[in-house]
Interface confidence: low
């Protein structure tokens, strides 16, 4: 640090005083010097280092009429809102010719009520879930002892005896307030009061109960919610994108979820109006009077392929001797999936039912066994997808073929004398 030489007498006739106060105090340090000739610039030092950005003002008063006469120079350093960083030893410094002069030191000190560097913050926590709160304070004077309070009740017998900077709370079952007191020799400061809101725990075990082509039934296990009963749970569903739907290198904006509310209990919900055979993602959160839980992770689910919703249409069955010609058209009702084929069942009055898988053809010729005396033969047809058979048509009686009736060429299907499948007639 610069030091004054003793070759000449110090020009300083007034040195900085001392300031001690609490944070936020405004004060002024002052030094005065008398010099001959042109007045020098006065610099301020703190702990030996020049203050480059000091809030200082310099006043110069001539004592004579000639420039070479003496001048009185006064420099004032203003300290606004005293902080810990302002404390230390202050001196004035001037350069006169080839010599450097420094004033006697003055001291700035900080002393008052404790000052909070960190205070507990409002937050939400799940019921019965551990968490930590923070509080930090300083003087001077030191030491500073902390006392935590929960709902205005001290958590220790005296300051400094309980948890200090960090308070570990093993869990809450009701919304509570927390604050901390900071104690030092000057007195007590109280922190802000933090409200810790107790929310329900995240639901668990979200799973599918049943699936249908256009609806899903899901269930879950609720988490603990403290003293606050759950009011409802909210389920969200979105179409899964499977990485598809990307164009120009950018994915589509996410679909806004379909949101449904479920009364509780039961912790179960049916979600309808969905696409058949389509992947979705679902999640659930539950709400009490204090607010909602966090969402579960997205659960991938998929609606199944459905069975056709109606039977084949326009079934006709005609007989010509030992052959029966049956044809039909695709169901008019939605197939709810990929049509894999048709099943046909026929039965005579006194014969067991015969069940056949026709594939995707819409016509078949049956070669009737025996002497052709099978009576009251009826035929039913159903369409099927991978999900199973759709509804069977009403039984259609076999009509005798009349000359002139159109008879398309069909592939013959010879049935074995013993039916491959036997099925109780409905």
């Amino acid at each position: 640090a610069p030091r004054g030489t003793q070759a000449e007498e110090s020009p300083f006739v007034g040195n900085p005083g001392n300031i001690t106060g609490a944070r936020g105090l405004t004060g002024t340090l002052r030094c005065q010097l008398q010099v001959q000739g042109e007045p020098p610039e006065v610099h301020w030092l703190r702990d030996g280092q020049i203050l480059e950005l000091a809030d200082s003002t310099q006043t110069q008063v001539p004592l004579g009429e000639d420039e070479q006469d003496d001048w009185i120079v006064v420099s004032q350093l203003r300290i606004t809102s005293l902080q810990l960083s302002d404390t230390g030893q202050y001196q004035c410094l001037v350069f006169l010719g080839h010599q450097t002069f420094v004033s006697q030191p003055g001291y700035v000190g900080l002393e008052g009520l404790p000052y909070f560097l960190e205070e507990p913050e409002d937050r939400t926590v799940a019921a019965n879930t551990p968490f930590n709160l923070s509080c930090q304070a300083q003087g001077p004077p030191e030491p500073v002892d902390l006392l935590w309070l929960q709902d205005a009740v001290p958590l220790a017998t005296a300051p400094g005896h309980g948890p200090q900077r960090s308070l570990h709370v093993p869990g809450l079952n009701k919304t509570s307030s927390f604050s901390c007191e900071a104690h030092n020799a000057k007195g007590v400061t109280t922190s802000r009061t933090a409200t810790i809101t107790v929310l329900p725990q995240q639901p668990r075990n979200l799973h599918l109960v049943s699936r249908q082509p256009t609806e899903l039934e899901v269930a879950w296990t609720p988490g603990l919610s403290g003293i606050y009963p759950l009011t409802h749970c909210t389920l969200q569903a979105v179409l899964s994108d499977d990485g598809m739907g990307i164009q120009a290198g950018e994915p589509d904006p996410p679909e806004e979820p379909l949101t449904s509310q479920a009364s509780v209990p039961p912790h179960q919900l049916r979600l309808g109006s969905l696409h058949p055979h389509t992947p979705y993602h679902i999640r659930v959160a539950c709400t009490s009077s204090q607010g909602p839980s966090s969402w579960t992770h997205w659960l991938p689910v998929e609606t199944p392929e459905g069975v056709p919703l109606g039977p084949p249409e326009n079934i006709s069955a005609t007989r010509n001797g030992s052959q029966a010609f049956v044809h039909w058209q695709e169901p008019r009702a939605p197939l709810q999936g990929t049509l894999l084929g048709y099943r046909l069942a026929y039965q005579g009055q006194d014969t067991p039912e015969v069940l056949m898988d026709i594939g995707l053809r819409q016509e078949v010729t049956l070669e009737l066994q025996g002497d052709g005396s099978v009576s009251n033969l009826t035929v039913c047809v159903a369409a099927y997808t991978a999900a199973g058979d759709g509804p069977w048509s009403l039984p259609v009686p076999l009509e005798a073929w009349r000359p002139g009736q159109a008879q398309p060429v069909h592939q013959l299907v010879k049935e074995p004398s013993t039916p491959a499948f036997s099925w109780p007639w409905w």
Partner: antibody, heavy 121, light 108 residues
Framework: EVQLLDSGGGLVQPGGSLRLSCAAS????????MSWVRQAPGKGLEWVSA????????YYADSVKGRFTISRDNSKNTLYLQMNSLRAADTAVYYC??????????????WGQGALVTVSS | EIVLTQSPGTLSLSPGERATLSCRAS???????LAWYQQKPGQAPRLLIY???SRATGIPDRFSGSGSGTDFTLTISRLEPEDFAVYYC?????????FGQGTKLEIK
Amino acid sequence: EVQLLDSGGGLVQPGGSLRLSCAASGFTFSSYAMSWVRQAPGKGLEWVSAISIGGGNAYYADSVKGRFTISRDNSKNTLYLQMNSLRAADTAVYYCAKPGFIMVRGPLDYWGQGALVTVSS
Amino acid sequence: EIVLTQSPGTLSLSPGERATLSCRASQSVSNSYLAWYQQKPGQAPRLLIYGASSRATGIPDRFSGSGSGTDFTLTISRLEPEDFAVYYCQQYGSSPYTFGQGTKLEIK
């Protein structure tokens, strides 16, 4: 019975604005995304815009992006299309349409009767 | 955006004949989210097929859809007089949800 009633069409000068409305009935409006589709005279169908069930996500054709705004009021069962900076190329019949499923990505199974918008000086 | 190209532009057939309409996408259509619509003069479009192959409620079984990826087909097995109209395909798998330019099916 599902019904979509389009209104608000008319004649407007280039650079002008118009707001179309679509009043929905016969289904739970708030459970379905909704779309606008337009058809210029003698031309094909052009998808214009769609909005998700709660109104949080909107989707637009490039030709109207930045000029048209789709919105909905679920309490009034009404869909809107605010059209600003209109051009002659926007002249068309505008149809409000409902998808068959809950999401924006759905086939349009019910359509309004259409509202004619003519942009001309 | 996905561009849908329909062919032919115009198809001239007689009642009772089979009609085959094509729709080709410039890139793969997500989850086969492709629909077919019929439109008659002065009327709003009517949904025929969704999900590339599922018939909408109340649509006669002479209408069928097929295809996946980028190539889709609408088939009308036996044309009835009321089937002569304009047919549009639309993809709804990726925004913007584009339409084809249409195929006009007219009586020969």
